[in-house]
């Protein structure tokens, strides 16, 4: 028993960020005369939250009217709570002293815990594109949550991934926390339409996790396959040669025709067709005037895709036979086709 006790009935209080915290405190006596003060923390570095005697505390209101006669309820409300407000709050009775007021009795303290929602997860992929069969890393970050417990999962097209590492910082006590996770994803040729999803679950989200996404279309590069074919004769002394550029992504592509190593024409892919998997096809053709050549002609379709080293495919066009005697099939059969990749 004591002549005055300061009672803080709540050992802990849990409040969502943005809400108002009520910290309860009553005194068993008004004697000795002196003010009540609220502090966050203990010891010399404690922070004054409210002083009954004097001061301006815009976020703090008293639950009771402290000017009311013989009031012994010194509970306070703190508005617009943020994670930075977390800590242990002490209701302290002072007695008048000479010259300064003297701390008389302290309550046992109320620990204020703040529940703060994590920020929307931000997923970022590699800086440079990568090709199928390569492994790329994706990172996911979310900040500002409290308490520390949090769950993070990775998905690719709805399938949960297992190859990832996650860290929550800081390791020790803090007002709020951040999560950082890195997942490894193996690319396939079909990934243009794929999505990588980072899913964060936290107590503040009430079972409705937050998701961040990254489209693999921003990460993948599918190199084209080339096919050069000789088409039936279109007119006397003319042969139509086509270069089929298939299954490439992204669309940025430049094609150059070479006749016996000399640039004949350069063009940029424009009117492309899109495949179901999101890759593109494109065709370029070259009309070769056979009569202009005495010897066989080596036609090369050279493709530079998305700033990568050029890929090419060649087709040998024999001019010894009379073009008008060649059928569409025999023309193709009578010409050899060499495939050559230049890196």
């Amino acid at each position: 028993e004591e002549e005055l006790q300061v009672i803080q009935p709540d050992k802990s209080v849990l409040v969502a960020a943005g809400e108002t915290a009520t910290l309860r405190c009553t005194a068993t006596s008004l004697i000795p005369v002196g003010p009540i003060q609220w502090f966050r923390g203990a010891g010399p570095g404690r922070e004054l939250i409210y002083n009954q005697k004097e001061g301006h505390f815009p976020r703090v209101t008293t639950v009771s009217d402290l000017t009311k006669r013989n009031n012994m309820d010194f509970s306070i409300r703190i508005g617009n709570i943020t994670p930075a407000d977390a800590g242990t709050y002490y209701c302290v009775k002072f007695r008048k002293g000479s010259p300064d007021d003297v701390e008389f009795k302290s309550g046992a303290g109320t620990e204020l815990s703040v529940r703060a929602k994590p920020s929307a997860p931000v997923v970022s992929g590699p800086a440079a594109r990568a090709t199928p069969q390569h492994t790329v890393s994706f990172t996911c970050e979310s900040h500002g949550f409290s308490p520390r417990d949090i769950t993070l999962k990775w998905f690719k097209n709805g399938n949960e991934l297992s190859d990832f590492q996650t860290n929550v910082d800081p390791v020790g006590e803090s007002v709020s926390y951040s999560i950082h996770s890195t997942a490894k994803v193996v690319l396939t040729r079909e990934d243009v339409h794929s999505q990588v999803i980072c899913e964060v679950a936290h107590v503040t989200l009430q079972g409705d996790p937050l998701r961040g996404t990254a489209n693999l279309s921003e990460t993948i590069r599918v190199p084209p396959t080339l096919e050069v074919t000789q088409q039936p004769v279109r007119a006397e002394n003319q042969v139509n040669v086509t270069c089929q550029v298939r299954k490439f992504y992204p669309q940025r592509l430049q094609l150059t025709w070479l006749e016996n190593g000399n640039v004949s024409r350069t063009e940029t892919a424009s009117t492309v067709t899109e495949n179901k998997d999101g890759t593109y096809n494109w065709m370029s053709w070259l009309l070769v005037n056979v009569s202009a050549h005495r010897d066989d002609v080596k036609l090369t379709c050279q493709v530079e895709h998305d700033g990568q080293p050029a890929v090419s495919k060649s087709h040998d066009l024999k001019v010894s036979a009379h073009p008008k005697e060649q059928g569409s099939n025999t023309a193709a059969e009578n010409t050899g086709s060499n495939e050559r990749n230049i890196y």
Partner: antibody, heavy 114, light 111 residues
């Protein structure tokens, strides 16, 4: 139940130091303060000072230079020392519990005389 | 120091009548919504007995015939109805400022 009992010499010579003891029961000296009050014969009450539960003290400025209040918590005793006494210090001396002075001892009479 | 002036210095009251004692402080004894003024009864050869604390609150075991009122500098102790057993000296006391002080006392006699 709560009790306070003053004790000490009934006669003190002028210029000497008056020493009194207040022995308490029914409450803890760490939880409650104890006051000393005196009452000269036929006169009113005068507050001398208080020792709080934490051991800190507050004194009447008129007597502060001559007064010391201390305590021995383990023995449940509070002590008053008043130095350089004169006949004007002749009084009944009371100890009373806490800032509220809700319980009083019966008092002890101290006469200052040669 | 806060000086407490009690009046009257003495009064004689018949049993069943009302006795009113006033205590005027030289400065306010109010702080933080309370008046730190208290009243004591002292009979000859006995220590003071607490009657009223914080101007108007009855101490445990004190008959409801006793009541206190007032704030700031002016306070009143009322005994209604007075009984023969109420003959005593009555003191007001403040502990709002150091040094804590008592009034000079009022002697109540029963006719």
């Amino acid at each position: 139940q709560v009790q306070l009992q003053e004790s000490g010499p009934g006669l003190v010579k002028p210029s000497q130091t008056l020493s009194l003891t207040c022995t308490v029961s029914g409450f803890s000296l760490t939880g409650y303060g104890v006051n000393w009050i005196r009452q000269p014969p036929g006169k009113g009450l005068e507050w001398i000072g208080i020792i709080w539960g934490d051991g800190s003290t507050d004194y009447n400025a008129a007597l502060k230079s001559r007064v010391t209040i201390s305590k021995d918590t383990s023995k449940n005793q509070v002590f008053l020392k008043l130095s350089s006494v004169t006949a004007a210090d002749t009084a009944v001396y009371y100890c009373a519990r806490a800032g509220k002075m809700d319980y009083w001892g019966q008092g002890t009479t101290v006469t200052v005389s040669s | 120091d806060i000086v407490l002036t009690q009046s009257p210095a003495s009064l004689a009251v018949s049993p069943g009548q009302r006795a009113t004692i006033t205590c005027r402080a030289s400065e306010s004894v109010d702080s933080y919504g309370s008046s730190f003024m208290h009243w004591y009864q002292q009979k000859p050869g006995q220590p003071p007995k607490p009657l009223i604390y914080l101007a108007s609150n009855l101490e445990s075991g004190v008959p409801a015939r006793f009541s206190g009122s007032g704030s700031g500098t002016d306070f009143t102790l009322t005994i209604n109805p007075v009984e023969a057993n109420d003959a005593a000296n009555y003191y007001c006391q403040q502990n709002n400022e150091y040094p804590w002080t008592f009034g000079g006392g009022t002697k109540v006699e029963i006719k």
